[in-house]
Interface confidence: medium
């Protein structure tokens, strides 16, 4: 039959060439002379001339060695024609399969592969994958089947079989426990790729396994005990820097320390923070310490890491003995602000009150007193006893110095410490009113018409407080009552002045005496301008000139 089975030809053949492969034969050659030819890539199209056919015998010829890795299969067509050139057969498929020879070594895709794995992982944990390729045939032969192996491990600690590699996938896994970054931070593996499934040619590459840090080391105090001295009352004062060592990776959450005061700070006097660079614990005072209340604090501080421990680890604790140093503290007035009621106008030399301070220090220090601020100069203070006395007239109605009946004085206490310290107190004198002011009318000048005059209403003011004020009483004196009348209204806080007889235009003094509820009398002269006019007037008109 006009059929050829697929022809297998090994690559890299040694010849001699041309080499006969197979004979094309048509059974039509009994009837007529047949001429054979071939077409297709490798014959009459690129790569041309690899194959040829003997025109008359039909022998298929190979002209040169084949390379499977270049072309693995050739598909040609065989033709048979008679002498006159007429086709005697349909074109026939000729398949030439190039069979593989192990003529390529495996090649790793990289010279150096890099991977990483956490320290302390369980055996079986995958680390990384290496890959090698081989151009030879891995489907029909083992020539291109790559097998991976680990040739060597550096360092060989804790032993030389820390990793394994999957023979066919190149996946590197941990095979032993004991990966410890703090002892071996990096392994260098020489990996091999061998074709023929491990029996053939070999090539090598490097696999670098970085051991990643896990928080498997607790920070430890070094030293474990501290002594510190802190002046009392100091807030935000750095007491002590606590030092820890941690074998984990510096500046990582597994290394960064977190400090906790776990005992000894019942009054919440202290706070502790982590220094961002040194990792030290900075112990500072949150509140002022009081030497007199407690002169020594023993603190217990625990240290852990920002990251949780990956296995059960003990926590390290440090003891800090804080000695509080005595500071000469300022005397404190008791109370800090003292309110005393005193009558205004008391005689000079009269005692007002005793105002003293206490010294927080345990030593019996001597305290001396003086007045720091006395705006009106009304008071004096005994330096030894703190006795305050009047040296001027206390005047409740003095608006320059007295606000809402209160006169404010600042006093100072000084101890005899070294150096001396001072404290201040505020003395608030509530001045009790005495009836030392009579009622006064407002305004004290009026303008009024001498015909049909309008009554003049004057307001009455009294600087004193009730009951030394209204109701008021009014009386005209010095013959003023001949021309004028003065009446206090029902509410008792205004007086109405009226002109009861004709007076010629001029200015007159009206002598008005007002007395308060406590019968304190005040005589006031009202200047009354009388105008020639009717009814209401504000200023007198000029003289009328007839024409």
């Amino acid at each position: 039959d006009w059929v050829v089975a697929p022809i297998s030809v090994p690559e890299n053949g040694k010849g001699p060439f041309p080499q006969r492969l197979n004979q094309l034969k048509s059974n039509k050659d009994r009837d007529t002379k047949i001429f054979y030819s071939i077409t297709g890539p490798g014959a009459d199209s690129p790569p041309e001339g690899v194959f040829a056919v003997e025109k008359e015998t039909g022998w298929l010829l190979l002209n040169k060695p084949l390379d499977r890795e270049e072309i693995a299969k050739y598909e040609l067509f065989g033709h048979a024609v008679s002498e006159n050139g007429a086709s005697v057969e349909d074109p026939m498929n000729i398949s030439i399969i190039v069979t593989d020879q192990n003529d390529h070594k495996p090649k790793f895709t990289q010279d150096t592969f890099r991977g990483s794995v956490l320290e302390g992982v369980m055996p079986g944990t995958s680390v990384m994958q290496v890959t090698a390729t081989d151009e030879d045939d891995a489907v029909n032969t083992y020539n291109g089947v790559v097998a991976y192996s680990i040739h060597s491990q550096e360092p060989k600690e804790p032993h030389d079989l820390m990793f394994t590699i999957h023979k066919s996938t190149g996946t590197i896994s941990v095979i032993s426990s004991g990966l410890d970054r703090e002892k071996v931070p990096e392994y260098r593996l020489t990996v091999q790729a061998t074709d023929m499934d491990g029996e053939g040619s070999t090539t090598t590459a490097e696999a670098v396994v970085q051991i990643l840090d896990a928080n498997d080391n607790a920070p430890e105090f070094d030293p474990q005990k501290y002594e510190a001295h802190v002046p009392e009352n100091a807030v935000g004062h750095e007491v002590q820097r606590l030092t820890v060592t941690d074998l984990d990776a510096p500046n990582s959450p597994a290394w960064r320390a977190t400090y906790l005061i776990m005992g000894g700070d019942d009054g919440d006097h202290f706070t502790i923070t982590t220094h961002p660079e040194s990792n030290q614990g900075i112990l500072t005072t949150r509140k002022g310490l009081d030497f007199e209340a407690k002169n020594q604090h023993t603190l217990y501080v625990e240290v852990t890491n920002e990251a949780p421990f990956v296995l059960k680890l003990p926590t390290s604790t440090a003891t800090i003995v804080v000695h509080v140093e005595d500071v000469n503290e300022a005397p404190v007035f008791v109370p800090p602000s003292k309110v005393v009621e005193v009558q205004e106008g008391i005689p000079t030399g009269e005692p007002v009150c005793v105002y003293t301070a206490e010294d927080p220090d345990k030593e019996n220090q001597k305290i001396s007193y003086r007045i720091l601020r006395d705006p009106a100069g009304w008071l004096a203070m005994d330096p030894d006893s703190g006795q305050v006395t009047a040296v001027g007239t206390l005047d409740r109605e003095d608006e320059q110095f007295v606000r809402n009946n209160i006169y404010e004085v600042m006093v100072l206490a000084m101890d005899n410490g070294s150096p001396p310290t001072t404290g201040t107190g505020t003395l608030l004198l509530t001045l009790i009113d005495v009836n030392d002011h009579g009622p006064v009318p407002e305004p004290r000048q009026i303008t009024i018409c001498n015909q049909s005059p309008v009554r003049q209403v004057l307001n009455i003011t009294d600087k004193d407080l009730s009951p030394h004020t209204s109701p008021f009483q009014a009386q005209l004196t010095d013959d003023s009552d001949i021309y004028w009348t003065a009446e206090v209204n029902e509410e008792g806080d205004t007086v109405v002045l009226s002109l009861k007889k004709f007076l010629k235009q001029d200015t007159y003094d009206v002598h008005l005496s007002l007395s308060d509820h406590g019968n304190k009398e005040q005589l006031t002269v009202i200047r009354a301008t009388v105008c020639d006019c009717h009814g209401h007037v504000e200023t007198c008109p000029g003289p009328w000139k007839g024409g």
């Epitope: 430890e220 105090f221 070094d222 030293p223 474990q224 005990k225 059960k312 003990p314 926590t315 003891t319």
Partner: antibody, heavy 120, light 107 residues
């Protein structure tokens, strides 16, 4: 290398006192508690107390108070244990041991022990 | 004080054997349990601290486990040099206290 070395054996009479020394090297002596442990013949171990060489701070097991005084000399990296008013009951091997930490104490480095025999 | 009970007080085993020593605390000690080895010449060494952490230089055939009040020390593949008395010790409460010891001998 962290080392803790103790003084040699002592034979003393009842009622007398004895002072055992423990010399440390290879670490910051002032920064770690030094412990003392007793082992009577054929018996277990008993913690006596410890001292912080940095400041001389001490803590004692209640049963040894009055019997034992612990001191330390920072300049010579040496810890001392004085046993007073000795009786035959105090015959034992006394160990000093460096503490690893201030809490959850474990004794990381031990001296070789000093044998004290109280006998008339 | 906290009492530590160690069992057995003595045991005999063959080279290559797996040996386990137990220690019980009279109350919870929160894993602050340590193991020591005392050789026949009297020298004492720390083996394991905080229940299961191997002290530096200690062979990996030694391991520790436990929690709460019950703890154990295991030697996985007994060697001649392991002949010694083993003590447990708690460090959770003052004063620190030791177990009575386990004397290990070779059959």
């Amino acid at each position: 290398v962290q080392l803790v070395e103790q003084s040699g054996a002592e034979v003393v009479k009842p009622g007398a006192s004895v002072k055992i020394t423990c010399k440390a090297s290879g670490y910051a002596f002032s920064s770690y508690w030094m412990n003392w442990v007793r082992q009577r013949p054929g018996k277990g171990l008993e913690w006596i107390g410890h001292i912080y060489p940095g400041d001389g701070d001490t803590n004692y097991n209640g049963k040894f108070k009055g019997k034992v005084t612990l001191t330390a000399d920072k300049s010579s990296n040496t810890a001392y244990m004085q046993l007073s008013d000795l009786t035959p009951e105090d015959s034992a091997v006394y160990f000093c041991a460096r503490d690893r930490g201030s809490f959850g104490a474990w004794f990381a480095y031990w001296g070789q022990g000093t044998t004290v025999t109280v006998s008339s | 004080e906290l009492v530590m009970t160690q069992t057995p007080s003595s045991l005999s085993a063959s080279l290559g054997d797996r040996v386990t020593i137990s220690c019980r605390a009279s109350q919870d000690i929160s894993n602050y349990l340590n193991w020591y080895q005392q050789k026949p010449d009297g020298t004492v060494k720390l083996l394991i601290y905080y229940t299961s952490r191997l002290h530096s230089g200690v062979p990996s055939r030694f391991s520790g486990s436990g929690s709460g009040t019950d703890y154990s020390l295991t030697i996985s593949n007994l060697e001649q040099e392991d002949i010694a008395t083993y003590f447990c010790q708690q460090g959770n409460r003052n004063p620190p206290t030791f177990g009575g010891g386990t004397k290990l001998e070779i059959k």
